[in-house]
């Protein structure tokens, strides 16, 4: 697994460099994350041929995965910091049950899958402080998601994989835009 | 391999409207991370960013210019469209699409065009 | 608007020097920073991203360093072939900008 954020070399190397901002912490957590995903997107890719497979393809999955759309106020057009940053949150509360899927779907990557589980549990706390309205934040259901995830696991082995591939480059998809919008922070 | 190729008119009086269309291959538009920005370059002076099109439609605008430009896109087609308004001669430059492509969203500029002068 | 600062203007070098050329961002731009090399009449081209990180195709003379607001391109044994004008990049906010770039000649 990669070393997590503030321990990497650069920062052995500079020991007087000023302690990162808020905003530089999230965004590092969020590049952290990441190449925990691309790592194992790699091995994704190389068990299954699900990466060729076309975006008409997939689309026809019903995962109920988040997705950033403009409503969000994460946009430049429309852009509203407090509502972009609770669909932020939300958003990664909802992928929890997905990352948590994953834990069993990797062989060599097991611990990175953990990594990226843990740091992203992280980066929810990083966002929670942040923002100003936690009402406004709806918890998914405990009970809802624990019988997504039997029904996940159920899955044949071809589906699986599919789920798999989804919940990665969707949840790439979703950091994505969530660093975008965060610079604007 | 990756290419990009500018078109438009070489030639706009003052005040009409710029229209330049960028067509890429190699690529998709629609793939997380990738982004096409316009840039141009008068005549024997620097670079200066235009405006940037997200792969899933946000974009971004330089503010000294945001009142009179517009990008868009067309997936279906590999195009990425510019339009500027009311030109003036100061205009006159070479203009260039790139691409940028990383996990990160760093903007490092990968792939460029060839550019096309507009006067 | 973050403004890049290059320095110097023009450097005027004989084949087999080592040179740096230096980019000063006027505030903090981490990691976000790149190099394009742009020879006459051909378009840009990026040369070192992020800082350090080199790009393929490119030789392994041109390598780049610095953190926070201070950046150096460096070339280890300039080649007639690296004339140009080189240019760095804020990739940290909005609107991206370019330093007004750095001429490289011959003697």
């Known amino acids: 697994a990669p070393v997590p954020p503030g321990e990497d070399s650069k920062d052995v190397a500079a020991p007087h460099r000023q302690p990162l901002t808020s905003s530089e912490r999230i965004d590092k957590q969020i590049r952290y994350i990441l190449d925990g995903i691309s790592a194992l997107r790699k091995e994704t890719c190389n068990k299954s041929n699900m990466c060729e497979s076309s975006k008409e393809a997939l689309a026809e999955n019903n995962l109920n995965l988040p997705k950033m759309a403009e409503k969000d106020g994460c946009f430049q057009s429309g852009f509203n910091e407090e509502t972009c940053l609770v669909k932020i949150i939300t958003g990664l509360l909802e992928f929890e049950v997905y990352l948590e899927y994953l834990q069993n779907r990797f062989e060599s990557s097991e611990e990175q899958a953990r990594a990226v589980q843990m740091s992203t549990k992280v980066l929810i706390q990083f966002l929670q402080k942040k923002a100003k309205n936690l009402d406004a934040i709806t918890t998914p259901d405990p009970t809802t998601n624990a019988s997504l995830l039997t029904k996940l696991q159920a899955q044949n082995q071809w589906l699986q994989d599919m789920t798999t591939h989804l919940i990665l480059r969707s949840f790439k998809e979703f950091l994505q835009s969530s660093l975008r919008a965060l610079r604007q922070m | 391999q990756v290419t990009l190729k500018e078109s438009g008119p070489a030639l706009v009086k003052p005040t009409q409207t710029l229209t330049l269309t960028c067509t890429f291959s190699?690529?998709?538009?629609?793939?997380?991370?990738?982004?096409v920005s316009w840039i141009r370059q008068p005549p024997g002076k620097a670079l200066e960013w235009l405006a940037l099109?997200?792969?899933?439609?946000?974009?971004r605008y330089n503010p000294s210019l945001r009142s009179r430009l517009t990008i868009t896109k067309d997936t279906s087609k590999n195009q990425v469209v510019l339009t500027m308004t009311n030109m003036d001669p100061v205009d006159t430059a070479t203009y260039y699409c790139?691409?940028?492509?990383?996990?990160?969203?760093?903007?490092?500029?990968?792939?460029w065009g060839q550019g096309t002068l507009v006067t | 608007d973050i403004v890049m600062t290059q320095s110097p203007a023009t450097l005027s070098v004989t084949p087999g020097d080592r040179v740096s050329l230096s980019c000063r961002a006027s505030?903090?731009?981490?990691?976000?920073l790149h190099w394009y090399q742009q020879k006459s009449h051909e378009s840009p081209r990026l040369l070192i991203k992020?800082?350090?990180q080199s790009i393929s195709g490119i030789p392994s003379r041109f390598s780049g360093s610095g953190s926070g607001s201070d950046f150096t391109l460096s070339i280890n044994s300039v080649e007639p072939e690296d004339v140009g004008v080189y240019y760095c990049?804020?990739?940290?906010?909005?609107?991206?900008?370019f330093g007004a770039g750095t001429k490289l000649e011959l003697k």
């Open positions: 190699g690529f998709s538009l629609t793939t997380s991370g990738m982004c």
């Open positions: 790139a691409r940028s492509y990383d996990d990160y969203l760093y903007y490092a500029l990968d792939y």
């Open positions: 505030q903090s731009i981490s990691d976000y």
């Open positions: 099109i997200y792969w899933d439609d946000d974009k």
């Open positions: 992020s800082v350090s």
């Open positions: 990049q804020n990739g940290h906010s909005f609107p991206l900008t």
